[in-house]
């Protein structure tokens, strides 16, 4: 089947980089300046993302693929193909519509980004607080009081950090 | 096309002040939240004020509360930023920039950006 498509459809020997130009019986024809194809056998040519403003020029548009974009420093990229910037907030902060506001007692941040998460629950696993948590690091578990006898050294590193619940994707 | 147009930008002595204006074009303006963000020359991006979409909600960046006021006409579809007693360290690029779909619950992006309006607070 695809064999007699392609008899049938000249368009489909034309490769990413260019597309049939029915205007020109049906040739392959490059795409023009500030487009781009990135499949073979396409009738059009896709406009290039132009990075204006606040989003800058992470990779240049080719004939083969589109621009993408970053954002300013002091944001960052959210949202599929970086379409948002979101403001950056220090450690040990969350962003809020107010703002970056401080993380509550009890949580944490250790990111620019995402939200504060609930200090590891030592006791949960039978374990001891070894080091304090503050607003910008997890507390680290330690061993439990039992375990605290002679030779017995172990810590365990705290729990892995889950994503940061702040993206909309 | 979506497009945000800042216009009022200027030189200015400190203490003084200026009003910037944003016109939104090509959506519906009332129904988004709306921020104005700056640059000052050599730094990073900073966010200074929102709204939200009837004006009944307005938040501001610690360093010009008191003195900046963030308002809209969405019958016009323009956002405005009255500075008052403008310092030095006001100098920026200041943008409009609209609050994504999901704004205020799931993430704060803002996705319709201005190409910026110039503020040189100078004596």
């Known amino acids: 089947f695809e064999r007699t498509r392609s008899l049938q459809d000249p368009c489909s020997n034309c490769p990413a980089g260019t597309f049939c130009d029915n205007n020109r019986n049906q040739i392959c024809s490059p795409c023009p300046p500030n487009s781009f194809s990135s499949a073979g056998g396409q009738r059009t040519c896709d406009i290039c993302r132009q990075c204006k403003g606040v989003f800058r020029t992470r990779k240049e548009c080719s004939s083969t693929s589109n621009a993408e974009c970053d954002c300013t420093p002091g944001f960052h990229c959210l949202g599929a193909g970086c379409s948002m910037c979101e403001q950056d907030c220090k450690q040990g902060q969350e962003l809020t519509k107010k703002g970056c506001k401080d993380c509550c007692f009890g949580t944490f941040n250790d990111q620019k980004r995402g939200i504060c998460r609930p200090w590891t629950n030592c006791s949960l696993d039978g374990k001891s607080v070894l080091v304090n948590g503050t607003k910008e690091r997890d507390v680290v578990c330690g061993p439990s009081p039992a375990d605290l006898s002679p030779g017995a050294s172990s810590v365990t590193p705290p729990a892995p950090a889950r994503e940061p619940g702040h993206s909309p994707q | 096309e979506v497009q945000l147009v800042e216009s009022g930008g200027g030189l200015v002595q400190p203490g003084g002040s200026l009003r910037l204006s944003c016109a939104a074009s090509?959506?519906?303006?009332?129904?988004?939240?709306m921020n104005w963000v700056r640059q000052a020359p050599g730094k990073g991006l900073e966010w200074v004020a929102n709204i939200n979409q009837d004006g009944s909600e307005k938040y501001y960046v610690d360093s010009v509360k008191g003195r900046f006021t963030i308002s809209r006409d969405n019958a016009k579809n323009s956002l405005y930023l009255q500075m008052n007693s403008l310092r030095a360290e006001d100098t920026a690029v200041y943008y409009c920039?609209?609050?994504?779909?999901?704004?205020?619950?799931?993430?704060?992006?803002?996705?319709?950006w201005g190409l910026g309006t110039t503020v040189t607070v100078s004596s």
């Open positions: 090509g959506f519906t303006f009332s129904s988004y939240w």
């Open positions: 920039a609209r609050g994504g779909e999901e704004y205020g619950s799931s993430h704060y992006g803002m996705d319709v």
